[in-house]
């Protein structure tokens, strides 16, 4: 493959990353598929400044990052270390809360209204992030 | 209603150390980050630290890294400012100033206490 | 770090003159961008938040506007209480700066 020199279309660059910014929901699984899809992943927040520019673009409202403890430990999907990076939970959380109702506890998270991170069941149909690196290689074929 | 009351200013000599304290109250301390803010002697607002909520995150103005240290006790709804190797140049009021976790404005503040450095 | 600057530094106005002061980033804030008023020997006070949100309690003679870089504040009809020095600040990037300052002054 080729490297990437420039963001899709509809993608939104910032610092050597391409972000999509849904207006739609999914569940988290859902939505990490259509950004696999998309030769990207669910977005893994590294930065204070990098929280910032992804809570401009969504505004506030739940959407899902790149970020879950499914099997067990904290996990970004992009294999980002969680205990030494960068987290931005809300106070309490997060919680692995089983109150719900909808079986089970909470094991994705997502970008509240102010800005910082909950946990809840994955199944939620939120809105979501995708983020390519734009110094990776594309899965398509260079153009001749 | 919220208030904030910083404390510990005083005249100091350079190179020497001193601590600032902000009082708070009137609200839920330990769910607010907070930041320190100086001015001085007829100059403009200079942004100095912020701290998060509960104390997992710190973040400097370049001028005084290495030199102070913002922290808190969530159990005394305090915030602290410990000031090292201070300076003629950090002489100023020093005020505190909760953060809005969206924003990072600071939406209430301390009246401040004024810190001078001089021989 | 980002750099802020304000202009004018200082303006003489009459009670219900309008008035607007310009704040520029030396790059992109998004929409990280406040604005404060203080009077002497008194803390700043929030006034707009998120370049156009006007803070709880402040009147709606003061607004806010910009985006990206450049950025203003406008009062529509200047009180005899607004007389103060302006300063805007970038929340955007660590350290957070502010500019520095315009001084609304009583012509």
């Known amino acids: 493959g080729s490297e990437r020199t420039c963001c899709p279309v509809n993608w939104v660059e910032h610092e050597r990353s391409c972000y999509w910014f849904s207006r739609s929901g999914k569940a988290w699984a859902d939505a990490d598929n259509y950004c696999r899809l998309e030769d990207a992943h669910l977005v893994v927040v590294t930065s204070w400044e990098e929280q910032k520019f992804v809570q401009h673009h969504i505004g506030p409202v739940n959407t899902w990052m790149g970020l879950h403890d499914q099997n067990g430990p904290w996990k970004w999907v992009d294999g980002t270390d969680y205990e030494t990076g960068f987290k931005n939970w809300r106070p309490e959380q997060p919680d692995d809360w089983y109150g719900h109702g909808l079986g089970g506890g909470e094991d994705c998270a997502h970008f509240t209204d102010d800005g910082r991170w909950n946990d809840d069941v994955c199944q939620r149909p939120y809105r979501w992030v995708c983020e390519t690196e734009l110094d990776k290689a594309s899965q398509e074929p260079p153009l001749l | 209603q919220v208030q904030l009351v910083e404390s510990g200013g005083g005249v100091v000599q350079p190179g020497r150390s001193l601590r600032l304290s902000c009082a708070a109250s009137?609200?839920?301390?330990?769910?607010?980050?907070m930041h320190w803010v100086r001015q001085a002697p007829g100059k403009g607002l200079e942004w100095v630290s912020v701290i998060w909520y509960d104390g997992s995150d710190k973040y400097y103005e370049d001028s005084v890294k290495g030199r102070f240290t913002i922290s808190r006790d969530n159990s005394k709804n305090t915030l602290y400012l410990q000031m090292n190797s201070l300076r003629a140049e950090d002489t100023a009021v020093y005020y505190c100033a909760r953060d809005h976790p969206r924003w990072s404005y600071g939406d209430y503040w301390g009246q401040g206490t004024l810190v001078t450095v001089s021989s | 770090d980002i750099q802020m600057t304000q202009s004018p530094s200082s303006l003489s106005a009459s009670v219900g003159d309008g008035v607007t002061i310009t704040c520029r980033a030396s790059?992109?804030?998004?929409?990280?961008l406040n604005w404060y008023q203080q009077k002497p020997g008194k803390a700043p006070k929030l006034l707009i938040y998120g370049v156009s949100s006007l803070q709880s309690g402040v009147p709606s003679r003061f607004s806010g506007s910009g985006s990206g870089t450049d950025f203003s504040l406008t009062i529509s009809s200047l009180q005899p209480e607004d007389f103060a020095t302006y300063y805007c600040q970038q929340s955007y990037s660590t350290p957070f700066t502010f500019g520095p300052g315009t001084k609304v002054d009583i012509k």
């Open positions: 009137g609200f839920t301390f330990s769910s607010y980050g």
């Open positions: 790059q992109t804030i998004l929409s990280y």
